[in-house]
């Protein structure tokens, strides 16, 4: 067979689906690799071919589209399972070709089992809700295209193991779940199960997501530098180790990049000819406010180093702040035998 542009195994698309549920999987060629869509390809006389490699096998085989009740079918650029079976797990390849052109890509499909409380090896999307912010909604994800708009599915929402009913602040509203006001206690896994009929059969779609309640933008402030501050003086003798922590609190801000850095005499530590190391640690509150600590360390400080300016800087989407550390050379305590005696006029 002639050459084929092989995009390899697209591990970015690690598709996970539940056993015994419908799954519709679009050929990734048109979404990520080619600059034209399926309709254009089809009208240009290109054919889309599917095949697969079973889990723990090397042999590529055609997909059996003649199973009872059309369990596996293809529609345009979509591969359909109605429903999946555990042994459908494997690497699937879609190939677009005619006599002069060929392009293909493979992707892994994993069929997973869930337990009675919807726990599974499935990687869960995280949805962030602002604490005490007013009405916010989550929507049952990835259910588009499974049934026509004329079909009215039933949707049941669960928190963990339990149907959501008679909750004070959480109300199921069809495909949406409304949080009248979100609290830390609303953290957890939420599952929607969509049930719909098709050709005399009933199908179910289970979708679980993790809700994380985070700090509200109403309460967000610019970065706050707790250390260094005006109450602490770093007094060292030459030869001692100088350790200065820069501790900064950042309010949670969606998609904000929090940055902390030191300058020494207005320059980055890397641009100064001294042996300085900086260690960073990060901790988070329950609402994902962040505290970053960067410890500036000079193992054996010189008297020159003790004259320098050490400034901690911090930046977030809310603003930029800076604070200088007060660094001094320790004045040696007087030695009695010489200095004190001289002071008393001894000869």
């Amino acid at each position: 067979s002639e050459r084929c542009d092989d995009w390899g195994l697209d591990t970015m698309r690690q598709i996970q689906v539940f056993e015994d549920e419908p799954a519709r999987i679009k050929c990734p060629l048109f979404e990520h690799f080619l600059k034209f869509n399926y309709s254009t390809a089809h009208s240009a006389g290109l054919t889309l071919i599917w095949y697969w490699t079973r889990q723990d096998r090397d042999l590529e085989e055609p997909i059996n589209f003649r199973l009872p009740e059309n369990r596996i079918s293809k529609e345009k650029d979509v591969l359909w399972f109605r429903p999946t079976l555990l042994n459908d797990t494997g690497n699937y390849t879609c190939m677009l070709r005619n006599t002069t052109y060929c392009s293909k890509v493979a992707f892994p499909l994993e069929v997973v089992q869930k337990d009675s409380c919807f726990n599974s090896p499935m990687k869960l999307p995280v949805h962030k809700l602002y604490i005490e912010y007013g009405i916010q909604r989550i929507t049952c994800p990835n259910v588009d295209g499974y049934f026509p708009s004329s079909v009215k599915p039933t949707i049941t929402w669960y928190m963990g193991c339990y149907k959501i009913q008679n909750f004070n602040n959480v109300i199921p509203e069809g495909m949406n779940l409304s949080f009248l006001i979100a609290f830390i206690s609303n953290n957890g896994n939420y599952t929607c199960v969509v049930t719909y009929p098709e050709n005399g059969r009933t199908f179910h779609l289970t979708r679980t997501l993790t809700v994380k309640v985070v700090g509200s933008p109403k309460n967000a402030v610019p970065p706050v530098i707790h250390s260094p501050n005006d109450h602490v003086v770093y007094e060292k003798e030459p030869g001692e180790e100088l350790l200065i922590p820069c501790t900064v609190y950042f309010s949670f801000l969606m998609d904000s990049r929090n940055e902390v850095w030191w300058t020494i005499d207005g320059k980055k530590p890397d641009d100064i000819p001294i042996d300085v190391t900086i260690n960073e640690s990060i901790s988070h509150s329950r609402t994902e406010d962040e505290t970053r600590t960067q410890i500036l360390s000079i193992k054996k400080v010189t008297s020159e180093d003790l004259k320098r300016s050490y400034v901690c800087h911090a930046r977030s989407a809310k603003g930029e702040v800076a604070k200088a550390a007060t660094v001094k050379q320790k004045v040696p305590a007087p030695r009695y035998t010489v200095e004190l005696a001289c002071g008393f006029g001894a000869t």
Epitope: Q113, K114, D115, S116, T156, K163, Q165, H204
Partner: antibody
């Protein structure tokens, strides 16, 4: 298509036990609840309990707690209901009913258990 | 346990009639209500789930409605094959409980 085939009718003595089987096919046995419901002659339906074969999680009606045991064998896709300390009022048709969620979508044909001395 | 009360316990209607069966719960069940049909000597069959969701393959003459504690099953045009006993069942709170049943006959 979903099929639930139950074991045959049983005649039991008071104080003994009965074990009814329900063999499932046409769906993923591990991923659905298997319920057990009974119906005394000429009476209504009474839910006894359910099991999730995937993890063995069970829920029982208080009335049957301690007297009924639900089990499932994933290798043969078979669910079992064992009822002990039988009395005459346990004479009934016992049904298994499969449900992906809580509704019982599909039912077995029923097993008549007669308790008589 | 939640008590389910069905009425009437039996009814007789003519072919083509509109038939209504009601089911009342002892407390709110948030639409978590199923309707089953049981023909003589047969196992029950699911007709409607979650108050109004028609189970696959069930004729559209069957419909369900209601909220809170009160629910209704309607057969818009009674057919001879609809002769059966109909049960409501709540699945809001364990244990699941059934109504006493409504026997539907043809006049």
């Amino acid at each position: 298509q979903v099929q639930l085939v139950q074991s045959g009718a049983e005649v039991k003595k008071p104080g003994s036990s009965v074990k009814v089987s329900c063999k499932a096919s046409g769906y993923a046995f591990s991923s659905s609840w298997m319920n057990w419901v009974r119906q005394a002659p000429g009476q209504g339906l009474e839910w006894m309990g359910r099991i999730y074969p995937g993890d063995g999680n069970t829920h029982y009606a208080q009335k049957f707690q301690g007297r009924v045991t639900l089990t499932a064998d994933k290798s043969t896709s078979t669910a079992y209901m064992e009822l002990s300390s039988l009395r005459s009022e346990d004479t009934a048709v016992y049904y298994c009913g499969e449900g992906y969620l809580d509704p019982m979508d599909y039912w077995g044909q029923g097993t008549l258990v007669t308790v008589s001395s | 346990d939640i008590q389910m009360t069905q009425s009437p316990s039996s009814l007789s209607a003519s072919v083509g009639d509109r038939v209504t069966i009601t089911c009342s719960a002892s407390q709110g069940i948030n639409n978590y209500l199923n309707w089953y049909q049981q023909k003589p000597g047969k196992a029950p069959k699911l007709l409607i789930h979650y108050t109004s969701g028609l189970h696959a393959g069930v004729p559209s003459r069957f419909s369900g409605s209601g909220s809170g504690t009160d629910y209704t099953l309607t057969i818009s045009s009674l057919q001879p094959e609809d002769v059966a006993t109909y049960y409501c069942q709540q699945y809001s709170i364990l244990p699941w409980t059934f109504g006493g049943g409504t026997k539907v006959e043809i006049k």
